[in-house]
Interface confidence: low
């Protein structure tokens, strides 16, 4: 499907609004420190150039690849060396090495200030004064903080952001209308970013075979009535879309995602009965809806898997003829029968089945060898079932904050070398699994919990890769994508760790603690908890609970005092001394 001018082709396919939005996202994800105005200027220049190519595809430079055009544009930024250091060296390379170089310099934890939400009236004035700039600023600020955010989905978030302001800035109580919507968009956005980051890690670190296996399992759960060939086609198309987005090819990605949505809606009958309501929606909403669509009902009377995959004498013949197709069919058949399993569990089962066939098909009596293969699945299934049961019981007993604290202690003991901010962020997010999944019916708990944990642990892996400090984390992150969560679960107290020296400064608090939001207060306390465990890794639960209870009481007392700062100055050292004694 070749075109004389790729940039003209994408401009025509996507339309000016989406074209400009995607180019802004692409540039913001590559040059995360550049000011907004600089990016807008670059985007406008690219857009004007694209229009000349639409008018005449033979015009000068219109035949260049998008990577060449965009890379050349990024390399015109005057302050590249001062702002980005060695990333400026990318500009000395030719395509495709230059784009690969830009990709490698994407920063998952950029040193950017947290976004502060202005007063509602200030935001509404800015929205009304210049709606286009206001929305571009949203795309820019999200994209630079989340360099792997799924670009076409970010356009959908921006459309919802616009709709929230359009509605709420007219409302009688603007704040009551707007703030819950912005909170929802923020939380959904963070979740969307983390889910996409796992997809990109899967493709980049483990290859497209790993991603395709994930997609076969997930789509087979969603579309259990679809034939294997149909699922395979969707998997191939979906892999192309995500490979493009993860590779920075955002225009191609958005275009191909739109084609995939069109295909799914034209072929609902052979995919799923649940697609109808999605297919009536406009493009961005339709694609989002299709991605989030609930599982279709399982076909009635599906035959036992054992007949084709255990009892048949042709198992080894079928496996040898086309290994990946046979394993893909096994995964498809298993997944469509088990919406109650996590995708990661299904992939472990497929891996175990593959290992059994590799061993048995070379044996003297293959059939005898693999006859009990399904029995070997039992412990693999029970492990996540038990984990979910135990952790949901603990969550129900403790509530979210204290459940997070239990996980903070657990993970700090496992990998104490990891930085405190990372341990706090990751453990807080691990702790959110309780509220997200434990209220669900039994059949939905495991897929919710384990697949969410995979997303959170990927964040740990991504941050750790930037600054590696623990061999155990590196091992769990790199050895096997599907076994990451069991690998972390299996880690014990790190006996080799030398406890961190006590630093009174870490446990010195001030009156500003009292003006923090509840969430910020929790983060402060949890930061102190991690530092305590790093100082005393063998402290018991009871000891740590005692110290944390004293901490809460000390903060509460001083925040009620007339002279708060004096109270912190006086009571702080007493709290530190008492804590040291309690942990001695």
């Amino acid at each position: 499907d070749t075109h004389k001018s790729e940039v003209a082709h994408r401009f025509k396919d996507l339309g000016e609004e989406h074209f400009k939005g995607l180019v802004l996202v692409a540039f913001s994800q590559y040059l995360q420190q550049c000011p907004f105005e600089e990016h807008v200027k670059l985007v406008n220049e690219v857009t004007e150039f694209a229009k000349t190519c639409v008018a005449d595809e033979s015009a000068e430079n219109c035949d260049k690849s998008l990577h060449t055009l965009f890379g050349d544009k990024l390399c015109t930024v005057a302050t590249l060396r001062e702002t980005y250091g060695e990333m400026a060296d990318c500009c000395a390379k030719q395509e495709p090495e230059r784009n690969e170089c830009f990709l490698q310099h994407k920063d998952d934890n950029p040193n950017l200030p947290p976004l502060v939400r202005p007063e509602v009236d200030v935001m509404c004035t800015a929205f009304h004064d210049n709606e286009a700039t206001f929305l571009k600023k949203y795309l820019y600020e999200v994209a630079r903080r989340h360099p792997y955010f799924y670009a076409p989905e970010l356009l959908f978030f921006a459309a919802r952001y616009k709709a929230a302001f359009a509605e709420c800035c007219q409302a009688a109580d603007k704040a009551a209308c707007l703030l819950p919507k912005l909170d929802e968009l923020r939380d959904e956005g963070k979740a969307s970013s983390a889910k996409q980051r796992l997809k990109c890690a899967s493709l980049q670190k483990f290859g497209d075979r790993a991603f395709k296996a994930w997609a076969v399992a997930r789509l087979s759960q969603k579309f259990p009535k679809a034939e294997f060939a149909e699922v395979s086609k969707l998997v191939t198309d979906l892999t192309k879309v995500h490979t493009e987005c993860c590779h920075g090819d955002l225009l191609e990605c958005a275009d191909d995602r739109a084609d995939l949505a069109k295909y799914m809606c034209e072929n609902q009958d052979s995919i799923s009965s649940k697609l109808k309501e999605c297919c009536d929606k406009p493009l961005l909403e339709k694609s989002h809806c299709l991605a989030e669509v609930e599982n279709d009902e399982m076909p009635a009377d599906l035959p036992s898997l054992a007949a084709d995959y255990v009892e048949s004498k042709d198992v080894c013949k079928n496996y040898a003829e086309a290994k990946d197709v046979f394993l893909g069919m096994f995964l498809y058949e298993y997944a469509r029968r088990h919406p109650d399993y996590s995708v990661m569990l299904l992939l472990r089962l497929a891996k175990a089945y593959e290992a059994t066939l590799e061993k048995c098909c070379a044996a003297a009596d293959p059939h005898e060898c693999y006859a009990k293969v399904f029995d070997e699945f039992q412990p693999l299934v029970e492990e996540p079932q038990n984990l979910v049961k135990q952790n949901c019981e603990l969550f129900e007993q403790l509530g979210e904050y204290k459940f997070q604290n239990a996980l903070l202690v657990r993970y700090t003991k496992k990998v104490p070398q990891v930085s405190t901010p990372t341990l706090v962020e990751v453990s807080r997010n691990l702790g959110k699994v309780g509220a997200k999944c434990c209220k669900l019916p039994e059949a939905k708990r495991m897929p919710c919990a384990e697949d969410y944990l995979s997303v959170v642990l990927n964040r740990l892996c991504v941050l750790h890769e930037k600054t590696p400090v623990s061999e155990k984390v590196t091992k769990c992150c790199t050895e096997s994508l599907v076994n990451r969560r069991p690998c972390f679960s299996a880690l014990e107290l790190d006996e080799a760790y030398v406890p961190k020296a006590f630093n009174a400064e870490t446990f010195t608090f001030h009156a500003d603690m009292c003006t923090l939001s509840e969430k910020e207060k929790q983060v402060k306390k949890q930061t102190a908890l991690v530092e305590l465990v790093k100082h005393k890794p063998k402290a018991t639960k009871e000891q740590l609970k005692g110290v944390m209870d004293n901490f809460a009481a000390f903060v509460e007392k001083c925040c009620k005092a007339d002279d708060k700062e004096a109270c912190f100055a006086e009571e702080g050292p007493k709290f530190v001394a008492a804590s040291q004694a309690a942990l001695a």
Partner: nanobody
Framework: QVQLQESGGGLVQPGDSLRLSCAAS????????MSWVRQAPGREPEWVSA????????RYAESVKGRFTISRDNAKKTLYLQMNTLKPEDTAVYYC????????GSQGTQVTVSS
């Protein structure tokens, strides 16, 4: 991975015949209905013909009825399109698809009918 590979296209004169083939791999070919679709330059894809999994039930677009014949050989995992009495308006890229989709999943084969 599902793969469809068309062949048999070419440049012919009006009134001539051509036989297109589509070799399938990566799925259980004999379990699926198949279609031929064509796309002329600057035009939307147009469904041409379909055949059920066993080969008994065949369907055609009005524009090709009586001139084109769809068939399949499940043993060879191949789909065919016999095109007779070709007209200039049959000029397009022809590609095969699973089911009755008009979404392009393969490269296709170019058919040009011109005097």
């Amino acid at each position: 991975q599902v793969q469809l590979q068309e062949s048999g296209g070419g440049l012919v004169q009006p009134g001539d015949s051509l036989r297109l083939s589509c070799a399938a791999s990566g799925f259980t070919f004999g379990s699926f209905g198949m279609s031929w679709v064509r796309q002329a330059p600057g035009r939307e894809p147009e469904w041409v013909s379909a055949i059920d999994s066993g080969g008994a039930d065949t369907r055609y677009a009005e524009s090709v009825k009586g001139r084109f014949t769809i068939s399949r050989d499940n043993a060879k995992k191949t789909l065919y399109l016999q095109m007779n009495t070709l007209k200039p308006e049959d000029t397009a890229v022809y590609y095969c698809t699973i089911g009755r989709s008009t979404s392009r999943g393969s490269q296709g084969t170019q058919v040009t009918v011109s005097s």
